[in-house]
């Protein structure tokens, strides 16, 4: 089959790095300066990405690979391959149109990015606050109320030991 | 514009070797793809070895192995070394720098 789809098609011999080129009658030809095909059987190359502004170049582009883009500190990437760089925040803070705003009481963050989620609501699963939220942190949840009642303890203390051949006075 | 010519052909039994050289002139310093093609009676003309501009060598899955692309900047020249050669070896060299070619250099492989 591979003899066959060569015969038919040149192009389908061209390896990663070159492009079918028309202009030479079909034969391959290596990819121009900053371009590159990362699959053979091309008929272009494509251009290389160029990780310029509050991108910052990761992997540089070869004539067989693209170049990969990260963010500049204090941003990270959102999207496929890092297609756009969003500002980070503090703990505690999220991204809206205006910036960075503090969580709103009753809601925390613990990362750089992303929104504030409400706190744990403990009581749903019948729990008790242990360790109260912050806006930065979550809720701890503790024991049910009625663990922590008055003779409610799930741990029974030992009785008291007596000496054997002793009978009580 | 570049002008390139070949040296270095010949007839060689199978198994040998031969190196290739493609001096170069004219400005060649802002030229950053070097190739060697060959064409087979018959055949249309194949990409070899070359040079990509992220300065690595590649070589077409035939002759990997055998064949070793180099160039030397200060003497303005580009080699290819052919070992172990094969009867389908046989072709006319052609040396290339983005848009200019040389005029080939035959190489016969033959017992």
């Known amino acids: 089959f591979e003899r066959t789809r060569s015969l038919q098609d040149p192009c389908s011999n061209c390896p990663a790095g070159t492009f079918c080129d028309n202009n030479r009658n079909q034969i391959c030809s290596p990819c121009p300066p900053n371009s590159f095909s990362s699959a053979g059987g091309q008929r272009t190359c494509d251009i290389c990405r160029q990780c310029k502004g509050v991108f910052r170049t990761r992997k540089e582009c070869s004539s067989t690979s693209n170049a990969e883009c990260d963010c500049t500190p204090g941003f990270h990437c959102l999207g496929a391959g890092c297609s756009m760089c969003e500002q980070d925040c503090k703990q505690g803070q999220e991204l809206t149109k205006k910036g960075c705003k503090d969580c709103c009481f009753g809601t925390f963050n613990d990362q750089k990015r992303g929104i504030c989620r409400p706190w744990t609501n403990c009581s749903l699963d019948g729990k008790s606050v242990l360790v109260n939220g912050t806006k930065e942190r979550d809720v701890v949840c503790g024991p049910s109320p009625a663990d922590l009642s008055p003779g409610a303890s799930s741990v029974t203390p030992p009785a008291p030991a007596r000496e054997p051949g002793h009978s009580p006075q | 514009a570049v002008q390139l010519v070949e040296s270095g052909g010949g007839l060689v039994q199978p198994g040998g070797s031969l190196r290739l050289s493609c001096a170069a002139s004219g400005n060649i310093f802002s030229i950053r793809v070097w190739s060697w093609y060959r064409q087979a009676p018959g055949k249309q003309r194949e990409l070899v070895a070359w040079?990509?501009?992220?300065?690595?060598?590649h070589y077409t899955d035939s002759v990997k192995g055998r064949f070793t692309i180099s160039r030397d900047n200060t003497k303005k020249t580009l080699y290819l070394q052919m070992n172990s050669l094969k009867l389908e070896d046989t072709a006319v060299y052609y040396c290339?720098?983005?848009?200019?070619w040389g005029q080939g250099t035959q190489v016969t492989v033959s017992s």
């Open positions: 040079f990509a501009w992220d300065n690595i060598a």
């Open positions: 290339n720098s983005e848009d200019s």
